[in-house]
């Protein structure tokens, strides 16, 4: 007996071929001998089966001796043995219909679990193998689970169901809801405008929720909420903002915050959380601000950085086009009695300059000028 695998909701064509290449009488029946469809001359006739409105055939193929049974919008319960009667012969086809669905929504927060459930007809013993967009294979029976979803798990999951050495493939689109970056760092000179961007790693037609940016300044003993906002159909509206600093927020996605001035007292770490409507849990992105200040007080030229810097970062003071006078893995460096000229304060990581501030040192009888 021929075995055909079908997918729930799909359309399947069960073939039946006569030796004569012409239109002759045929009937399709189910295992209970209930007529599904057949022909009377050129007319398609239908029986009292449950498939009535979902069963069809192709008149144009009858003249070729082909008498297909086409079943639309397949259901698991359509799994059955179908019998084609033509030319005093009986052709049996076993149809097995499977369904594969994600347990919950196919839009899941980063870190959540994905469970795929296989619907199968009674008596079947299928095996399932799924391949994630990043190439990870998982195997199982009626259910497959993936815990701790990552951003790379977003995309099309391809699942193959094997039964009777036949296979049917399912494609499920999974969207992992997350920010593009888990963490970002912004380096600014004192007084510069600061732009924080929080791009999302997904696109959906309607995006509604609420968010907040909590800030832990390096100089402060506790964190404080800098801004709260609402998101409605991708439109951003500010609910509450602190007076110091007075952040500004863009009205459209991606989420965008502007700090008018980078000041040492603002240097630190922030955590932007976004709670999406109808989702349990929140999206998070960490943001860090490092602020640099270069000053000359009397005979002392000082360069300082505030904020979360890694121990491997190097802070240097050098006269333009000359070797560094001082270079340390510290958050402050200074030069006593600096000679006149344009001095550069550099924050670098393995030779790559992250932040630079210039200060002009005038001959000792005049005051310094900061460009």
């Amino acid at each position: 007996k021929k075995v055909v695998l079908g997918k729930k909701g799909d359309t399947v064509e069960l073939t039946c071929t006569a030796s004569q290449k012409k239109s002759i009488q045929f009937h399709w029946k189910n295992s209970n001998q209930i007529k599904i469809l057949g022909n009377q001359g050129s007319f398609l006739t239908k029986g009292p089966s449950k498939l009535n409105d979902r069963a069809d055939s192709r008149r144009s193929l009858w003249d070729q001796g082909n008498f297909p049974l086409i079943i639309k919008n397949l259901k698991i319960e359509d799994s059955d043995t179908y019998i084609c009667e033509v030319e005093d012969q009986k052709e049996e086809v076993q149809l097995l219909v499977f369904g594969l669905t994600a347990n919950s929504d196919t839009h899941l927060l980063q870190g959540q679990s994905l469970t795929l459930t296989l619907e199968s007809p009674p008596g079947s013993s299928p095996s399932v193998q799924c391949r994630s967009p990043r190439g990870k294979n998982i195997q199982g029976g009626k259910t497959l689970s993936v815990s701790q979803l990552e951003l790379q798990d977003s995309g099309t999951w391809t699942c193959t169901v094997l039964q009777n050495q036949k296979k049917v493939e399912f494609k499920i689109d999974i969207v992992v809801l997350a920010f593009q970056k888990a963490s970002s760092i912004v380096y600014k000179k004192e007084g510069e405008q600061v732009e924080f961007s929080f791009p999302l790693a997904f696109t959906v037609e309607k995006l509604t929720g609420s968010g907040e940016l909590w800030w832990q300044a390096e100089r402060a003993s506790s964190s404080k909420s800098w801004i709260t906002f609402d998101l409605k159909n991708k439109e951003v509206s500010v609910k509450r903002v602190t007076q110091d600093p007075k952040l500004q927020m863009g009205k459209k996605l991606p989420l965008h915050l502007t700090l008018p001035q980078a000041l040492p007292q603002y240097a630190g770490s922030g955590n932007l959380t976004l709670a999406l409507e109808a989702k349990t849990g929140k999206l998070h992105q960490e943001v860090n601000l490092v602020v640099m200040r270069a000053t000359q007080l009397q005979k002392n030229l000082t360069c300082e950085v505030w904020g979360p810097t890694s121990p491997k970062l190097m802070l240097s003071l050098k006269l333009e086009n000359k070797e560094a006078k001082v270079s340390k893995r510290e958050k402050a460096v200074w030069v006593l009695n600096p000679e006149a000229g344009m001095w550069q304060c550099l924050l670098s990581d393995s030779g790559q300059v992250l932040l630079e501030s210039n200060i002009k040192v005038l001959p000792t009888w005049s005051t310094p000028v900061q460009p």
């Epitope: 997918k7 909701g9 799909d10 359309t11 399947v12 064509e13 001359g41 050129s42 007319f43 398609l44 069809d56 192709r58 008149r59 144009s60 003249d63 086409i70 079943i71 639309k72």
Partner: antibody
């Protein structure tokens, strides 16, 4: 809801090969046949041929010698190639899903054959 | 090949009118006939299949009848959006063939 999106070269020279592709989105690919139909300017509709997911084809005898329809089930796409085109092949070409009736249809692609 | 002949080739009518278009097959096609509506720059749209079954989403003012070789498409009360070209198509045998079309114009 099933949608068909088609594309291909719109301007050809006589004797060249016409090549069009149709992608099927949002529905079953197996179980149906996938057709190409054309409509020359100011004329009626002409069925070119069809294919199913397993590659079984039926062609209009009037075009059979020049037509090849192929399928790529991994992408839910099917393609039309019509060789040795002449000005008489200038038409809007449509792809469509069919069991017995054509529904839905692609948006159509105007192919002009001119030297 | 089965030839499909539509009549008239064009018809002028007003909003609210009842319009009938006929289609004749060169041989018996039982009920293997469909009707399509085609507007300029758009894809044809299936209206009626199996000679008399109304396609889902199509207004009930459209109806089809006939069997064998003679078929009709009737629009009971013309609406402004109905002005288009109408085609019949046989699905009885390969190659599938269409009528030459009936252009329905505003009077």
């Amino acid at each position: 809801q099933v949608q068909l999106q088609q594309w291909g070269a719109g301007l050809l020279k006589p004797s060249e090969t016409l090549s069009l592709t149709c992608a099927v989105y949002g529905g079953s690919f197996s179980g149906y046949y996938w057709s190409w139909i054309r409509q020359p300017p100011g004329k009626g509709l002409e069925w070119i041929g069809e294919i199913n997911h397993s590659g079984s084809t039926n062609y209009n005898p009037s075009l059979k010698s020049r037509v090849t329809i192929s399928v790529d089930t991994s992408k839910n796409q099917f393609s039309l190639k019509l060789s040795s085109v002449t000005a008489a092949d200038t038409a809007v070409y449509y792809c469509a899903r069919v069991i017995n009736w054509f529904d839905p249809w692609g948006q159509g692609t105007l192919v002009t054959v001119s030297s | 090949d089965i030839q499909m002949t539509q009549s008239p080739s064009s018809v002028s009518a007003s909003v609210g009118d009842r319009v009938t278009i006929t289609c004749r097959a060169s041989q018996d096609i039982s009920s293997w006939l469909a009707w399509y509506q085609h507007k300029p720059g758009k894809a044809p749209k299936l209206l009626i299949y199996a000679a008399s079954s109304l396609q889902s989403g199509v207004p009930s003012r459209f109806s089809g009848s006939g069997s064998g070789t003679d078929f009709t498409l009737t629009i009971s009360s013309l609406q402004p959006e109905d002005f288009a070209t109408y085609y019949c198509q046989q699905a009885n045998s390969f190659p599938y063939t269409f009528g030459q079309g009936t252009k329905l114009e505003i009077k």
